[in-house]
């Protein structure tokens, strides 16, 4: 099971596999989620203790029963890996630290003038693995300024110091926000020279370009195959560096491949995780545990939930099966590669799917028609529900907005398929912020089917709301994850931290936007609102938002979008941009659909369509 | 850390009134929600309402309607359950609690309220 | 509104046992459940819920099924620690309502 929550002054006893120091506890459980052994975790602030040396001390576990004891520790702050926690698992680590110098190896210096200029720099720096900025008011006036890029052996800091005006971060290539680009070609026979920083054993050249990209130092690998002439070395995967951040020389080998890692791609990143099965191969480790069932897939599935277990083998040994039910073998090791691998077998062997994201995890994103009137420019994974709709006619463009609520549906308004029913003739693209970034090569979602609320009539307001199925299921990545939706007892509530998210008109006769826009609205009471749209019936199906002085509201081409509102610390849907009477007026509120009213339609429909429901409701 | 401390135990007469208090600490207050739970001696949960003290909304049982009132003071970070006309079956332990998303991920220690003539 | 049963009011197991704890809504609920586990004189502890999953400090031997308007717990081996007072809550439609509760005891 997935275990989210965090214990405060406490500290597990025992069960060490690994240290190291990190500016927070949210980066410890990362890096423990992606430690092979690691379950559970405890970081030490720099309040929580007096000895320098174990300040900003992260502690990783492994625990057979996956429990350890725990101690009380005053400011001590433990908790779980995350793995099995699908969408949740990401590498990606954007916070800025302020008062903090995390130390290692100094590679580059340089003037700029914000810690976001330095946190891009790193970000774009192949070598670059966190940094530190000395603000204009760092006591030693020939530092201010300072962009300080960093590597360490570990990839985290070698120390963290505390420190008046001085920033410190991560590179966000985790978060595939690289502007160096990455090479994506498989070389076959050819050997790559320079410094191994790691060696494991993979069954082929992908699972080891995964892993490349996972190492904090790895940049680019060479894999013997199974054929390689020297048998002791067959499925090494190599990973390797250099100074210069590329191989200084490659030599033609036979029965070699080599390649790069993908940390530096732009937009995505492969997941962390390796999901082929290998068959007629067997992988051998530590026994976790042995397991009667039938077929392979259901192996994995059960490696998978077992949380220590990393890699699995099935044996189809006539010996090893009675009935339809075969031995699983559950398998771990130290590196979480296996620590043999062979071949000829009747064995089928594969991965625990643990640190996949594209789970259909149960619990919703976390992350902090009609353009946003008033607004600012959004980041890269802010509003990773946000959707655009486009018709593809002579010419493409952007229609509506909508929210992404489970890998197969989107949640749209009713009105924004006013006069274009055709389900071909739409283009719906995920994970996106600039609308210019769409390209012909741009991946796109088309549509399986549109489902437009019974009671909607064009040209009413009422019942503004469509449910759109996708002809396939979308992966869940940094960029592309849906919004929770609300209870149906929700209906009443009050929400005070609002937003609304769409590339329409930043005026009333404007034009469609670029980059992805967002605005912070407070709701308006519908008692409120009627009394501003008097010739119109606001129904409690209907949610207001606005300001009274107007000035910042959505607008042409935001229809369908998001509003989400932050609140018992998750983020929700609360309703669909629907209509208004301008954009950003005096005293005329936005009018949305309120999504809390059609929970029950919104789940039937779903669950009538698929079977079960496929939403990514808090469910 | 999130902690929710209660006020005292309180020994009512019947048709009398209770405030029951709900000092928060280790979160922004308004921020969240906070919501009233009873619990009579020996028997099961019983939700009585809720307040946003971000927004002063508040939700209600219909059972508890016209005789619960809940508060919240910013400037303190605490809320109030005050519960009028009481009646025997009053008695119970009342709890707030704090949710996370929808769930009560934390509680409050309870207080005891019990009616007697 | 809607009315939560949990069919059984108490229970006794040996330690070791797999329990399973019932808890049936009036209505469908849409899998917005959460269970919560009550020690005496204390505060019911939120165990899990479809918001949150399992609350972190229960043991992985809890897991949580159902959909519709049936909902189970279980406990894969029961353990002295696990002796308590269970219910179930539902948060599809206010007002939130719980069921009665199940005491489980060891035999």
């Known amino acids: 099971g997935c275990l989210t929550q965090l214990y405060e002054n406490a500290f597990f006893r025992g069960g060490d596999v690994a240290s190291m120091y990190t500016p927070n506890a949210q980066y410890c459980q990362m890096r423990c989620t992606f430690h092979p052994r690691c379950l559970l975790f405890s970081f030490l602030p720099a309040s929580s203790i007096n000895d320098m040396e174990k300040r900003f001390g992260c502690f990783l576990k492994d625990s057979v029963t996956g429990t350890l004891p725990k101690v009380h520790r005053t400011g001590a702050v433990s908790g779980h890996s995350l793995k099995q926690c699908g969408h949740q698992i990401s590498a990606c680590h954007r916070d800025i630290y302020k008062g903090v110098d995390m130390r290692g190896v100094n590679f580059n210096v340089s003037k700029v003038s914000s810690v976001e200029e330095c946190q891009k720099r790193c970000t774009s720096n192949i070598r670059c693995q966190f940094f530190s900025y000395a603000t204009q008011t760092f006591h030693k006036a020939e530092y201010r300024n300072n962009c300080l890029l960093k590597y360490s052996p570990g990839g985290t800091p070698t120390a963290i110091k505390v420190l008046s005006n001085v920033e410190s971060g991560f590179s966000l290539k985790p978060c595939a926000l690289s502007e160096i680009g990455c090479h994506m070609n498989i070389f076959q026979h050819l050997a790559f020279s320079d410094v191994d920083v790691a060696r494991v054993l993979t069954p082929d050249a992908f699972v080891c370009r995964t892993i490349c990209t996972y190492h904090p130092n790895c940049l680019f690998f060479t894999f013997y195959t199974n054929v390689w002439k020297i048998e002791s070395q067959r499925n090494v995967c190599l990973l390797k560096t250099s100074e210069s951040g590329t191989p200084s020389s490659s030599t033609p080998q036979e029965n070699t491949i080599s390649g790069y890692s993908l940390l530096t791609c732009k937009r995505t990143l492969p997941e962390p995780c390796h999901s082929k099965i290998y068959p007629g191969v067997d992988f051998g480790g530590e026994e976790l545990n042995v397991t009667f069932v039938k077929g392979v897939n259901v192996c994995q599935e059960t490696c998978t939930k077992m949380i220590r277990c990393q890699f699995f083998t099935y044996s189809l040994l006539p010996e090893d099966c009675k009935e339809e039910k075969c031995k699983c073998f559950l398998r771990l090791s130290m590196d979480g590669s296996p620590t043999r691998i062979a071949y000829g077998t009747q064995g089928s062997s594969g991965y625990s799917l643990r640190l996949c994201n594209t789970g259909d995890n149960s619990v919703c994103t976390t992350k902090t028609s009609t353009r946003i009137v008033g607004g600012t420019n959004s980041s890269w994974g802010e509003w990773p529900w946000q959707v655009s709709l486009q018709v593809k006619l002579t010419a493409q463009r952007h229609l509506c907005g909508g929210s992404l609520i489970g890998h197969q549906w989107v949640l749209t308004a009713a009105h924004c398929f006013d006069g274009l029913p055709l389900q071909d003739v739409w283009r719906i693209y995920s994970g996106i912020l600039n609308l210019s970034d769409i390209t012909k090569d741009t991946p796109f979602s088309q549509i399986k089917e549109i489902i437009i609320h019974q009671n909607y009539k064009v040209s009413e307001g009422n019942h503004d709301i469509a449910l759109i199925k996708l002809q396939a299921p979308l992966n869940y990545t940094e960029f592309q994850k849906p919004i929770c939706l609300p209870s149906k007892g929700d209906t009443s509530t009050i929400y005070t931290n609002c937003w609304v998210t769409g590339w329409g008109f930043s005026k009333e006769k404007g034009e469609i936007q670029n980059i992805l826009q967002k605005v912070n609205i407070p709701l308006v009471t519908n008692e409120e609102c009627q009394k501003r749209y008097q010739d119109y019936k606001i129904t409690q199906r209907m949610v207001c938002a606005g300001y009274k002085e107007g000035g910042k509201d959505a607008c042409k081409g935001d229809s369908g979008g998001p509003l989400v509102c932050k609140h018992n610390g998750m983020w929700r849907l609360v309703g669909i941009t629907s209509w208004g009477e301008g954009c950003a007026r005096r005293e005329q509120p936005g009018v949305y659909t309120k999504v809390a009213e059609y929970m029950d339609w919104i789940l039937e429909k779903t669950q009538s369509s698929d079977g079960k429901a496929q939403m990514q409701s808090p469910a | 850390q999130v902690q929710l401390v209660q006020s005292g135990a309180e020994v009512k007469k019947p048709g009398a009134s209770v405030k029951v208090s709900c000092k928060a600490s280790g979160y922004t207050f308004t921020d969240y929600e906070m919501h009233w739970v009873r619990q009579p001696p020996g028997k099961g949960l019983e939700w009585i309402g809720a307040i946003h003290p971000g927004s002063g909304g508040t939700a209600y049982n219909q059972k508890f309607k016209g005789r619960v009132t809940i508060t919240a003071d910013k400037s303190t970070s605490t809320a109030y359950m005050e519960l009028s006309s009481l009646r025997s079956e009053d008695t119970a332990v009342y709890y707030c609690a704090r949710p996370y998303g929808y769930p009560f991920a934390y509680w409050g220690q309870g207080t005891l309220v019990t009616v007697s003539s | 509104d809607i009315q939560m049963t949990q069919s059984s009011s108490s229970f006794s197991g040996s330690l070791g046992d797999r329990v399973t704890i019932t808890c049936k809504a009036s209505e469908d609920i849409y899998n917005r459940l959460a269970w919560y586990q009550q020690k005496p004189g204390n505060a019911p502890r939120l165990l899990m819920s479809?918001?949150?999953g399992l609350e972190a400090g229960f043991h992985l031997r809890f897991s949580g099924s159902g959909s519709g308007k049936d909902y189970t717990l279980s406990i894969a081996s029961l353990q002295t620690e696990d002796v308590a007072t269970y219910y179930c809550?539902?948060?599809?439609?206010?007002?939130?309502?719980f069921g009665g509760g199940t005491k489980l005891e060891i035999k």
């Open positions: 809550q539902q948060y599809w439609s206010t007002p939130w309502t």
């Open positions: 479809g918001e949150t």
